[in-house]
């Protein structure tokens, strides 16, 4: 059970001790469903900077390096929690907010066949 | 600038009003780098339940439905913020924690050639 309002220490503890969080930084370019990363900045939010993935192509890259439209590049999305200043510009009062972010892209078999 | 300790309202505001967070729920099965979702539960954490992706294969699924080892299935990871009860079992005192989660998998061209 969680109360409505709690005290939160913002001195972040990083539990990623056994893994390198930068590890997947080149997947955006090597994937068969490559993506670009776009910076989303909002000073009223914590964290203020979030990187969003946007798939480069509708189709997927085949072995020849060409886009194959028999497959689809799609974003993998995740709901994450962020802190939103409430009221706005408040220095030490926040509200939890759930946002949907695109983390990367994957190549899927299409289920809608409406293109020539 | 953010102070060290803040008040947080846990009554979550959901900004995903224009999107369907379930939309990508079938990608795990349709992807050329399919994955399974595993429940990670921790009562000392908020949110207490996080779903983690586990790639099914070493290689990627080709057009014939077989695993192609000329390509690699890899996890797409993201660092997310969660709240950790501090001290443990505390009802209304938390600390921000950064954890690395696997959100899904993507198919990449290999850079490590150590297999026959």
């Amino acid at each position: 059970n969680f109360p409505r309002t709690v005290m939160v220490n913002l001195n972040i503890h990083n539990r990623n001790t056994n893994t390198n969080p930068k590890r997947s930084s080149d997947y955006y370019d090597r994937s068969t469903s490559p993506w670009n990363l776009h910076r989303n900045e909002d000073p009223e939010r914590y964290p203020s900077v979030i990187w969003e993935a946007k798939c480069r192509h509708l189709g997927c890259i085949n072995a020849d390096g060409n886009v194959d439209y028999h497959m689809n590049s799609v974003p993998i999305q995740q709901e994450i929690l962020v802190l939103r200043r409430e009221p706005p510009h408040s220095p030490n009062s926040f509200r939890l907010e759930k946002i949907l972010v695109s983390v990367g892209c994957t190549c899927v078999t299409p289920i809608v066949h409406h293109v020539a | 600038n953010f102070p060290r300790t803040v008040m947080v309202n846990l009554n979550i505001h959901n900004r995903n009003t224009n999107t369907n967070p379930k939309r990508s729920s079938d990608y795990y099965d349709r992807s050329t780098s399919p994955w399974n979702l595993h429940r990670n539960e921790d009562p000392e954490r908020y949110p207490s339940v996080i779903w983690e992706a586990k790639c099914r294969h070493l290689g990627c699924i080709n057009a014939d439905g077989n695993v192609d080892y000329h390509m690699n299935s890899v996890p797409i990871q993201q660092e997310i913020l969660v709240l950790r009860r501090e001290p443990p079992h505390s009802p209304n005192s938390f600390r921000l924690e950064k954890i690395l989660v696997s959100v899904g998998c993507t198919c990449v061209t290999p850079i490590v050639h150590h297999v026959a």
């Epitope: 056994n18 390198n20 | 983690e52 586990k54 099914r56 070493l58 080892y69 890899v74 996890p75």
Partner: nanobody, 123 residues
Framework: QVQLVESGGGLVQVGGSLRLSCEVS????????MGWFRQAPEKEREFVAA????????RYAHFVKGRFTISRDNAKNTVHLQMDSLKPEDTAVYYC????????????????WGLGTQVTVSS
């Protein structure tokens, strides 16, 4: 913290067989592949074989292909390496490890190793 305990090594004659086992605990939820590696005296550690926990598909280094077989027991969090037609050049300490990025994992990315199990092939 991941813990890895390898066993099953020993002294064997050329052409003989051994079955190595690796007990794993503390694996991350997202862990999807396990591998066997080996290190001979005065040589660098090298990849031997890999298997995925879910699909069970496996891959091998060219120098063991057709002689070694990797398998896994999901219920017991254990990975095995059946080694047949052993050669003197298979002499090494054998290690298992979690492969967080599957076949994409680089050798310098393993931060922890078990003690390994010694395999000696005598002629």
């Amino acid at each position: 913290q991941v813990q890895l305990v390898e066993s099953g090594g020993g002294l064997v004659q050329v052409g003989g067989s051994l079955r190595l086992s690796c007990e794993v605990s503390g694996l991350p939820v997202s862990s999807y592949a396990m591998g066997w590696f080996r290190q001979a005296p005065e040589k660098e550690r090298e990849f031997v074989a890999a298997i995925s926990w879910i699909g069970g598909d496996s891959r091998y280094a060219h120098f063991v292909k057709g002689r070694f077989t990797i398998s896994r027991d999901n219920a017991k969090n254990t990975v095995h390496l059946q080694m047949d037609s052993l050669k003197p050049e298979d002499t090494a300490v054998y290690y298992c490890n979690d492969m967080p990025y599957g076949l994409d994992t680089r050798m310098d990315e393993y931060e922890y190793w078990g003690l390994g199990t010694q395999v000696t092939v005598s002629s």
